[in-house]
């Protein structure tokens, strides 16, 4: 059966300066390939976090993604600013050259409240 990407929250609200968690779970790790988080859709979407590298200031993984059986690809965004508002998508890729997007979560909209 095809892998499913589950983003349980349709939206979250967070005060500027605070942290928020964006939840994402997969139903399978197969086919092998990376998982990435984006803000927005289409050509202009912005890469927010990739589980293949560790250099993303203010964004960290919530679970230990190095567990070989890990299915939790939630992220925490720290020190949220108004510019962080938008809809975030957890996206599963199948390996290739280049990797191919095969499934996206339904998206979680982040609202940033003034402090």
């Amino acid at each position: 059966t095809e892998v499913k990407v589950i983003q349980p929250e349709k939206s979250v609200s967070v005060a500027a300066g605070d942290s928020t968690v964006l939840n994402c779970t997969l139903t399978s790790l197969l086919p092998v390939g990376p998982i990435r988080w984006y803000r927005g859709v289409g050509q202009s979407r912005q890469l927010i976090y990739s589980f293949t590298t560790e250099h993303f200031p203010r964004v960290t993984n919530v679970s230990d993604a190095t567990k070989r059986s890990n299915l939790d690809f939630s992220i925490r965004i720290s020190n949220v600013t108004p510019e962080d508002a938008g809809t975030y998508y957890c996206v599963k890729f199948q390996r290739g050259s280049p990797d191919t997007e095969i499934q996206s979560g339904g998206g979680t909209e982040v609202y940033v409240l003034a402090k």
């Epitope: 197969l30 092998v32 993604a65 190095t66 567990k67 070989r68 390996r95």
Partner: antibody, heavy 118, light 107 residues
Framework: DVQLVDSGGGVVRPGESLRLSCAAS????????MSWVRQAPGKGLEWLAG????????YYIDSVKGRFTISRDNSKNSLYLQMNSLTAEDTAVYYC???????????WGLGTLVTVSS | ALTQPASVSANPGETVKITCSGG??????YGWYQQKSPGSAPVTVI????KRPSDIPSRFSGSASGSAATLTITGVRVEDEAVYFC???????????FGAGTTLTVL
């Protein structure tokens, strides 16, 4: 620069135990899964065990399950392999290796030689 | 089990291809590891099918398709003489395996 320094090898008798260590530096050790790989004389590479970055999940090849235990101490930037009930077939150079995000290897230790002989 | 040729040879400047078969493209990632002498530390030349570490020369490249992976050395040099092991991680079993190694001789 990433550095992995294996130690703890030596000559032991069959049935005895040995604990190998791997000292890591040059990267955030607590962010990476790690593995042990060995190479018997004149043979190829054989993966033995892996451990998640936090240390809660461990994985073993069947032939060492129950005899070998992989562990880590992130406060000391160190990886360990406890080897019990050693046999002559365990004679090999043992390497620690850092895992990539998809559990392949990008950096290797220099190796430590374990000889099991009566 | 991963299968690779026992040996390959080439003249300096030629292109060498080493294949590794036996994995399942759906569940397996491949890497390539260079060992210049028995018991010396392996060096990763390719991981994640086609990713080259920053300190590895660009003449090394990797690819994967179907049930096989290929290491290509374009413009092989004398210093590339070594044993090359293919390795794989299987996302179904959570297990790593290696091929028996290919001895590259540069004539």
């Amino acid at each position: 620069d990433v550095q992995l320094v294996d130690s703890g090898g030596g000559v032991v008798r069959p049935g005895e135990s040995l604990r190998l260590s791997c000292a890591a530096s040059g990267f955030t050790f607590s962010s990476y899964a790690m593995s042990w790989v060995r190479q018997a004389p004149g043979k190829g590479l054989e993966w033995l065990a892996g451990i998640s970055a936090g240390g809660s999940d461990t994985y073993y090849i069947d032939s060492v399950k129950g005899r070998f235990t992989i562990s880590r101490d992130n406060s000391k930037n160190s990886l360990y392999l406890q080897m019990n009930s050693l046999t002559a077939e365990d004679t090999a150079v043992y390497y620690c290796a850092r895992e990539t995000w998809n559990h392949l290897f990008d950096y290797w230790g220099l190796g430590t030689l374990v000889t099991v002989s009566s | 089990a991963l299968t690779q040729p026992a040996s390959v040879s080439a003249n300096p400047g030629e292109t060498v291809k080493i294949t590794c078969s036996g994995g399942d493209y759906y569940s397996t990632y491949y890497g390539w590891y260079q060992q210049k002498s028995p018991g010396s530390a392996p060096v990763t030349v390719i991981h994640s099918d086609d990713k080259r570490p920053s300190d590895i020369p660009s003449r090394f490249s990797g690819s994967a398709s179907g049930s096989a992976a290929t290491l290509t050395i374009t413009g092989v040099r004398v210093e590339d003489e070594a044993v090359y092991f293919c390795g794989a991680y299987d996302g179904r079993t959570y297990i790593n395996t290696f091929g028996a190694g290919t001895t590259l001789t540069v004539l």
